[in-house]
Interface confidence: low
């Protein structure tokens, strides 16, 4: 798949559209002006303190514990409803989510609240689902969940290999750590950093601390951010955006599928995420967050997924001549952007089609066997096979190859699900182009 650029085919008559949202970033400049950025950061930090304390005192209490019961209905603000609510069908009301059953974390125009995650067996519930926050699950004692296999808790090793000594205990997010007695190097050969032996977690429930402690912590974060602003200048938003967008599941995609890695301790406490939600109380679509994006990129016509349908009014004859191409929304590497979404595909592609799909994509039976053997667990199998496919085919591993393979297999609904998911996650968007110039 080519990356979008000056020479990308332009759709005749199409023009750049932003996703529907409450406001547009007007008069965007090539780079952020530092004073304005500083003001935003400071404002964000101050808001963060008050917002966090408000969240703790109000939103995390069960309904019966709140001072005043939340109204069942209220009116949408600029077409969006606040966290803890979803919009009614007619768009006139905001209806509250059901405590303990479903939730919404941001300003939204969801027709339904998202269903609460239930912790798997082998997990403990760290914090319950509220109307504004999903359940947080953590591996039970003696097990851990690592980055490479976020879907399951794995048993911690009981001891270190011969000639090694234990320097770190089993925690819900890491196995025991072992180092060689003589050299002091970890099993992997790295020299252990001091921090690596610390077993406390940012994700464990914080003990009640004074406001001054919060302010000190936040101030440090602010200083770091201010330095970053000066260093990065115009690159700031480009650098921050990938973090803001989160991994594929994090963008309002499949409500059935909650990516567990986003629920691992600390993941939801990302300062960047907090700042964005404060700076954008009405959830400005991601395309509008890139404030220094040139007002009109030359030679390329981008369509946000939410508005692309308005350009699809030509006759069927013309429509058949065109192919709507999925491209990364943030101009990232197409193959890498797709790879970040693989973890979700196991829920979207029927199990019986996993192997036929991989054969269709060019994996040999032996490679499939190896992938199955390497997979951490059943759910991880498709992910592992897809990674093998990417490693094998490199730049040729495109979203369209994958979708076409599903179509060929007759898995049209799986194809639809993945296409929808890639769009609603905010990772991909449509580039309107001619079928004969379709990028793969």
């Amino acid at each position: 798949m080519e990356q979008r650029g000056q020479n990308a085919p332009a759709a005749s008559g199409a023009r750049k559209r932003h996703g529907p949202g409450p406001r547009e970033a007007r008069g965007a400049r090539p780079g952020p002006r530092v004073p304005k950025t500083l003001v935003l950061v400071v404002a964000a930090v101050l808001l963060l303190v008050s917002a966090e304390s408000a969240l703790i005192t109000q939103q995390d209490l069960a309904p019966q514990q709140r001072a005043a019961p939340q109204q069942k209905r209220s009116s949408p603000s600029e077409g969006l409803c606040p966290p803890g609510h979803h919009i009614s069908e007619d768009g006139r009301d905001c209806i509250s989510c059901k405590y303990g059953q479903d939730y919404s974390t941001h300003w939204n125009d969801l027709l339904f609240c998202l269903r609460c995650t239930r912790c798997d067996s082998g997990e403990v519930e760290l914090s319950p689902c509220t109307t504004t926050r999903n359940t947080v699950c953590q591996c039970e004692e003696g097990t851990f969940r690592e980055e490479d296999s976020p879907e399951m808790c794995r048993k911690c090793r009981t001891g270190c290999p011969r000639g090694m000594v234990k320097v770190g205990d089993c925690t819900p997010w890491s196995d025991i750590e072992c180092v060689h007695k003589e050299s002091g190097t970890k099993h992997s050969g790295e020299v252990p950093a001091v921090e690596e032996t610390v077993t406390s977690s940012p994700g464990t429930p914080a003990s009640p601390c004074s406001l001054s402690g919060i302010i000190i912590g936040v101030t440090v974060a602010a200083v770091v951010l201010i330095v970053a602003v000066f260093v990065c200048k115009s690159l700031l938003w480009k650098k921050v955006l990938p973090y803001l967008k989160g991994i594929c599941s994090g963008g309002g995609g499949d409500p059935e599928r909650v990516d567990r890695s986003s629920q691992r301790p600390g993941a939801e406490d990302n300062v960047l995420n907090e700042i964005v939600s404060i700076l954008q109380p009405t959830q400005v679509p991601e395309q509008e967050m890139e404030v220094q994006e040139p007002a009109e990129p030359t030679g390329v016509n981008m369509l946000s997924p939410g508005e692309s349908e308005h350009l699809l009014e030509p006759a069927e004859a013309e429509r058949s001549q065109r192919r709507r191409l999925l491209v990364p929304a943030n101009e990232g590497d197409p193959t890498e952007t797709l790879r970040q979404c693989f973890d979700d595909f196991a829920d979207l592609v029927p199990f019986d089609s996993w192997e036929p799909l991989m054969r269709k994509l060019g994996l040999m039976d032996n490679e499939i066997k190896v992938a199955k053997a390497e997979a951490a667990g059943h759910r991880d199998t498709l992910y592992t096979m897809l990674i093998k496919w990417v490693n094998k085919t490199g730049r040729d591993a495109s979203v369209h190859t994958l979708l076409d393979a599903l179509e060929t297999l007759g898995e049209r609904l799986a194809k639809q699900k993945i296409e929808d998911h890639l769009l609603s996650s905010g990772k991909f968007m449509y580039l309107e182009g001619n079928a004969d110039s379709a990028m793969s």
Partner: antibody, heavy 126, light 107 residues
């Protein structure tokens, strides 16, 4: 909220066009289905069209003969039935796919069909 | 195509009974399963989506469970208005398919 029309008695090989008028909800935000039920039999899915009309899928038994379409400006769903056969005799229901939408991006595979019309009867007989 | 097999095809029960209907998919469908209730001469009514989630407005006496290939619809305490035909439907892949139906009759 969904009212089907256009049913009737028709001879084999002839054509018929069914309509489904929607009201009470934002029609253009939902995928729509046709489902049929032959006399004394179970339910059979016929076709689906996405909210924007860009994707359409059909049951093998009607592929190439039936065409699903929609006019969002008129809040109406259609089923054009050509080359009708005796086995197409059934009550035809239109049904709304429950959608999950955020920022104008809708996905239609989470919640199934929640709103159904009362049906219109199609009889194919010589 | 994914075949959906419902059992039993019919059952007789009394008011107050606990009734269980099963549905089996010919291949794994995750939790992409819905249950519908249909009364004679009427359109189907959606009861459950995503295998276990209750459609809004549906009484809690209805519950669904299962994932993969085996699914269950349970009516905890049968009431006169519950005598009807129940269908399961998969929406994991096209073509969408329904089970053959289970007719719940008064004993």
């Amino acid at each position: 909220q969904l009212v089907e029309s256009g049913g009737g008695v028709v001879q084999p090989g002839r054509s018929l066009r069914l309509s489904c008028a929607a009201s009470g909800f934002t029609f253009s935000s939902y995928g729509m289905h046709w489902v049929r039920q032959a006399p004394g039999k179970g339910l059979e899915w016929v076709a689906v069209i996405w909210y924007d009309g860009r994707n359409k899928y059909y049951a093998d038994s009607v592929k190439g003969r039936f065409t699903i379409s929609r006019d969002n400006s008129k809040n109406t769903l259609y089923l054009q039935m050509n080359s009708l056969r005796a086995e197409d005799t059934a009550v035809y229901y239109c049904a709304r796919e429950v959608g999950y939408c955020t920022n104008g991006v809708c996905s239609y595979y989470y919640y199934g069909m929640d709103v159904w019309g009362q049906g219109t009867t199609v009889t194919v007989s010589s | 195509d994914i075949q959906m097999t419902q059992s039993p095809s019919s059952l007789s029960a009394s008011v107050g009974d606990r009734v269980t209907i099963t549905c089996r998919a010919s291949q794994g469908i995750s939790n992409y399963l819905a249950w519908f209730q249909q009364k004679p001469g009427k359109a189907p009514k959606s009861l459950i989506y995503a295998a276990s989630s209750l459609q809004s407005g549906v009484p809690s006496k209805f519950s669904g469970s299962g994932s993969g290939t085996d699914f269950t619809l349970t009516i905890s305490s049968l009431q006169p208005e519950d005598f009807a035909t129940y269908y399961c439907q998969q929406y994991n892949s096209y073509p969408l398919t329904f089970g053959g139906g289970t007719k719940v009759e008064i004993k």
